[in-house]
Structure formats: structure tokens, C-alpha cells
Amino acid sequence: CKAMHVAQPAVVLASSRGIASFVCEYASPGKATEVRVTVLRQADSQVTEVCAATYMMGNELTFLDDSICTGTSSGNQVNLTIQGLRAMDTGLYICKVELMYPPPYYLGIGNGTQIYVIDPEPCPDSDF
């Protein structure tokens, strides 16, 4: 019996508008009906929560209104989008999956996605 595996891409480049998207996929050891997905940022051995959402299997996952994350779910796959990123937000973003219900609870953690964010160059003043 293998432990729950969570897969996510190794590297993602954010768009010029500071938006990064990646897929977090997990192999479930049980028949979970309630799943919690958390995005955590790891920097200098400090881990901080970026956003979290709980969803019922078959339903959409919803983040809090003030969250910088949005996402959609399909089976054991979650498509995550993080918005409002700046160059200083470049770092390792870890997908954590918890099978919350029914018991038993299971924990799965991805290896992390290195998100690179490059601030756009300011537009030069036009001289017409």
C-alpha cells in the first residue's frame, strides 16, 4: 500500500500580468468526499500559507473572496491559478492535499513548483 502521491510541475513562469497557473494532481488511497487543497510558499525554510480551499468531490473548489488564488477541480486533479504576483514573490509553491472526510484523514505534499515572476518593464514615454 503506497502513500498518497501528489504531483505538480517543477517550474512555472508567471505571465507579464503576474498570473501563474499549474496543475496539482493526487493519487488518492481512499474514497474521499471532502478534500482540502492548500498552496504554501517555502522561502528560507519558512513556510507560509498562500491560500486554501475545501471542496466536495464533484463540486467546484472555492477560495475565500479575498484570496489571490482561484481554481477548478476535476476528479483527482486541481487547476490552480495565483494572481497578483510580483518579482519578490518568486519562490517554491507547494501543493498540499488533505483527504478530510470520511475518515481516515490522509496527507499528501507535492515537491513544489518554482514560480518565476518577472516584473514588466515600465512603458517608455511616447514622443509623438
Epitope: 502513500a3 504554501l40 517555502q42 486554501a52 507547494i94 475518515p103 496527507l107 505534499i109
Partner: antibody
């Protein structure tokens, strides 16, 4: 810094009830799973229960299922353990512990509170 | 439920000795394995988390290894303050079981 302080322990007769509290400070309480772990005199550590984040999901050890209820008040940063139908074998030091935000290890523990069930 | 076993249950060692404690899970727990040290009358103290990561402030003579079902805690050179009981614990699935403990005392 993270601080966990338990209270509510004492001597109680078999079949009676007791409620333990754990006051937390120094971190965003609602972002963490909170646990109770106990240790009977001269014995090893036994995980008792966990309550997750918003309090909607709880899991228990078989030895306390149906008798103990874990709860939390995120507005007060406080964790509780309601213990009903107490038995002699529930005699132990009860610790509250914070599960790590990433892998769930117990990096922070309370000092423990003793519950003695005796007639 | 995942059962955790530890060996030995107790050991006698001298200051400066290299000490190895093993922990085995009844099924794969990936790297969700933690090690704690406990002294009489005190709360447990985290030493190693995620099988091999050293907790901040813990001396480097402590190290952990393993994944899946087999794990090891090593104390490279036992110090007087290391005489205590050591527990492994899995944080992969409920119930979050502990091993029965290994008591390290003075030879």
C-alpha cells in the same frame, strides 16, 4: 513565539465528565490542525484527537470515540476536549499540540495537564 | 490503522557512543515520520521531522533517515543530556500513531 497552555485537569470519579482547555497564542490559530495527545503514568504517548482548521472535521482514537469531543473557538484561540464517561484507563497527562502547517509534526506542545480518574 | 514499532525498546550506552534507533510502519507513510525526545515530567520535544529534517535548535549529532516503512534515528556521539526516551510518530494518516518508545539509559 508559539505558546500553548492547558488547563482543566483534576481528580474525577469514573463515569463523570471533565473539560480541558488549551489557550494558544503567537500564531494564526485557524490555519493549524490542533491535537490532543495523552500519556498514562509510566506509559508511552497516545494520540487522542485532532480538529482541523475551521472545526468542521474531527478525528478520534478508537479508545475515546463516542466519549470525548474535541472542539475549538477560533475567535478565542482556544482548543477544548470534553471528556465524558471517564474511565480509570483515561488517567493520564493530556497535552495539546499544534500540527505543523506542512507535514503535521508537533513542533509546539503545551506543558500538559493531569487527569486522574479514581473513585 | 498504521502500526508503529520501535527497536530496541531500551538500550544502555556510554557518553560518546553512536546510538541507532529504528522505527517501522505497518504500511508506507512516505516521509511523514517524526522523532521526539522526552525526559521524565516534561513534554516531548521534536528532534526530527519529515524523516530527515533537523528541527531548529536541535544539535547536529541527531540525524534521521528512511522513507516508506523503515526509518532510523541516529545520535552520532551520545551526550549526558541525551539520556531520555525517544518516540517515532507518523503524521500521514489518522490515527496519528506513536511508536512504543526507546529508553536510552547510562551503561
Amino acid at each position: 513565539q508559539v505558546q500553548l497552555v492547558e488547563s482543566g485537569g483534576g481528580v474525577v470519579q469514573p463515569g463523570r465528565s471533565l473539560r480541558l482547555s488549551c489557550a494558544a497564542s503567537g500564531f494564526t490559530f485557524s490555519s493549524y490542525g490542533m491535537h490532543w495527545v495523552r500519556q498514562a503514568p509510566g506509559k508511552g504517548l497516545e494520540w487522542v484527537a485532532v480538529i482541523w482548521y475551521d472545526g468542521n472535521n474531527k478525528h478520534y482514537a478508537d479508545s475515546v470515540k463516542g466519549r470525548f469531543t474535541i472542539s475549538r473557538d477560533n475567535s478565542k484561540n482556544t482548543l477544548y476536549l470534553q471528556m465524558n464517561s471517564l474511565r480509570a484507563e483515561d488517567t493520564a497527562v493530556y497535552y495539546c499540540a499544534r500540527g505543523d502547517i506542512l507535514t503535521g509534526y508537533y513542533g509546539s506542545w503545551g506543558q500538559g495537564t493531569l487527569v486522574a480518574v479514581s473513585s | 490503522d498504521i502500526q508503529m514499532t520501535q527497536s530496541p525498546s531500551s538500550l544502555s550506552a556510554s557518553v560518546g557512543d553512536r546510538v541507532t534507533i529504528t522505527c517501522r510502519a505497518s504500511q508506507s507513510i512516505s516521509s511523514y515520520l517524526n522523532w521526539y525526545q522526552q525526559k521524565p515530567g516534561k513534554a516531548p520535544k521534536l528532534l526530527i521531522y519529515a524523516a530527515s529534517s533537523l528541527q531548529s535548535g536541535v544539535p547536529s549529532r541527531f540525524s534521521g533517515s528512511g522513507s516508506g516503512t523503515d526509518f532510523t534515528l541516529t545520535i552520532s556521539s551520545l551526550q549526558p543530556e541525551d539520556f531520555a526516551t525517544y518516540y517515532c510518530q507518523q503524521s500521514y494518516s489518522t490515527p496519528f500513531t506513536f511508536g512504543p518508545g526507546t529508553k536510552v539509559d547510562i551503561k
